[in-house]
């Protein structure tokens, strides 16, 4: 039960995280005009990964896409790449984890297969979260560097009284969304990996022995029925009516002196 809960929670947390990564990637407010200690302007500038926007006091907002690929800073391209890789890995991870969920029955899928899929999706979520965190952190570092550079050159003299105030940019909402979303995806991935350990069938050091009741060809397996969720085919605990003595692995067992009661 705890395994199912951990797996389910991991899936939900990762789903929220990936939705957040997608939202952050699409958001325009990766960097916003710094309003602190600056002259109050009637224009507010903010920039995203794909376009830059200007909101005027009049209420008019104008956005312009970055229609060049080669003209963009390498760091911005790297951040775009990291975010896209994060989204793609996360999306694949979600797809895989849906089939890995213990509460979803797909044919006669073995628990071991579900465990492997859970581990795969967990790793994908971890990498996806790390990509998002890395992307956002690279962008944040770029902002900090530019912020202090523009602060050093805050007022560029243009001769006499005339001055040009450089627009400084600070952290936008998308950065915080990205960090939180990346963290959630990472946590979700770790939960999936933890759930995988509980899903993996425990190896036993003995062969299950069949006891044949006289008059009935019913195989009895020691250890009783394991607790199950009620979903999925419980192949390891099914009764065998074919009259043959079978092991846990469905391999023919030869009678020994202890076989019959």
């Amino acid at each position: 039960m705890a395994v199912t809960a951990c797996q389910g929670l991991g899936f939900v947390v990762s789903l929220i995280g990936i939705a957040g990564i997608i939202a952050a990637t699409c958001m325009d407010q990766w960097s916003t005009q710094d309003l602190y200690n600056n002259p109050v302007t009637a224009v507010f500038n903010y920039q995203g990964l794909w376009r830059s926007c200007v909101r005027e006091s009049s209420g008019f907002t104008e956005c312009r896409g970055y229609f060049t690929l080669l003209g963009l800073p390498a760091m911005l391209q790297a951040v775009r790449a990291l975010m896209i890789v994060g989204i793609v890995l996360g999306a694949i991870g979600l797809l895989v984890s849906i089939f890995a969920l213990k509460c979803i029955r797909i044919g006669s899928m073995e628990d071991s297969a579900k465990a492997n899929m859970t581990l795969t999706s967990g790793i994908m979520f971890i990498v996806s979260g790390l990509c998002a965190i890395a992307g956002v952190s690279v962008f944040a570092n770029m902002l900090v560097t530019n912020f202090w550079m523009s602060t050093a050159n805050m007022y560029t003299g243009m001769g006499g009284m005339v001055q040009t105030v450089q627009t400084r940019y600070t952290f936008g909402a998308a950065l915080f969304v990205g960090w939180v979303a990346g963290g959630l995806t990472l946590i979700g991935g770790v939960m999936m990996c933890i759930a995988c350990r509980g899903l993996a069938p425990e190896e036993t050091n003995y062969k299950a022995v069949s006891y044949h009741a006289s008059g009935h060809s019913v195989a009895y397996k020691p250890g009783g029925f394991k607790a199950s969720t009620g979903f999925g085919s419980n192949t390891k605990n099914k009764k065998i009516y074919d009259g043959g003595a079978r092991t846990e692995d469905e391999v023919q067992s030869y009678p020994s002196k202890h076989d019959y009661v």
Epitope: Q33, P39, V40, T41, A42, V43, N45, Q47, S52, C53, V54, E56, S57, S58, G59, F60, E62, R64, M158, V162, Q163, T164, V165, Q166, T167
Partner: antibody, heavy 120, light 112 residues
């Protein structure tokens, strides 16, 4: 047709109060940024205050900060300017203006103005 | 506050003449985000409120004759009337639309 009609001006003693109104019509009042601009007897134009459309943020000229309050009633399509502690230098023709949404913050419509005289 | 300096303060012209007036701001009105200048020009005739002529330093407001041209960038701006008509006699004001407080120039009076 866009119309801005100011009212509420008059003669007031120094230290007195006055509330100007501006009735707007012909456009979606709540979504536009509105301003008050005054013209002194020397014909100089002075921006007084601005209220941002939608957000409601307000900005004031340093000379009126703490004394004047700009507000709006979107239900009545009316802009207000509450003026207290009036001084003789506040004597002017007060215009109600609208900031055009595609005009780079420029004031595309102006009312006819209402006169405020502060004198003892 | 941004200081807007207009010159000349008055200008005597004849009909059909080309007129140029200047406006200088103490700080750049060019926004780096969209590379637009936030400067407007207004025309005020006696007994009337100001009327918007040019916004964004160079864009004519609808209904304004093409004899009016705005130009300039950053801190130096110019309003040109290619052929002055009698109805153009008025006071022309430039305005900073970029920084609060919005500030106006003292005006350039166009007279015969």
């Amino acid at each position: 047709e866009v119309m801005l009609v100011e009212s509420g001006g008059g003669l007031v003693k120094p230290g007195g109060s006055l509330k100007l109104s501006c009735a707007a019509s012909g456009f979606t009042f709540s979504s536009y940024t509105m301003s008050w601009v005054r013209q002194t007897p020397e014909k100089r134009l002075e921006w007084v205050a601005t209220i941002i459309g939608g957000y409601g943020n307000t900005y004031y000229a340093d000379s009126v900060k703490g004394r004047f309050t700009i507000s709006r009633d979107s239900a009545k399509n009316t802009l207000y300017l509450q003026m207290i502690s009036l001084r003789s230098e506040d004597t002017a023709l007060y215009y109600c203006t609208r900031l055009g949404q595609t005009q780079r913050n420029a004031m595309d419509y102006w009312g006819q103005g209402t006169s405020v005289t502060v004198s003892s | 506050d941004i200081l807007m300096t207009q010159s000349p303060s008055s200008l005597s012209v004849s009909a059909g003449e080309k007129v140029t007036m200047s406006c200088k701001s103490s700080q750049s009105l060019l926004n780096s985000g969209n590379q637009k200048n936030y400067l407007a020009w207004y025309q005020q005739k006696p007994g009337q409120p100001p009327k918007l002529l040019i916004y964004g330093a160079s864009t004519r407001e609808s209904g304004v004759p093409d004899t009016f041209t705005g130009s300039g960038s950053g801190t130096d701006f110019t309003l040109t009337i290619s052929s002055v008509q009698a109805e153009d006699l008025a006071v022309y004001y430039c305005q900073n639309d970029y920084y609060y407080p919005f500030t106006f120039g003292a005006g350039t009076k166009l007279e015969l």
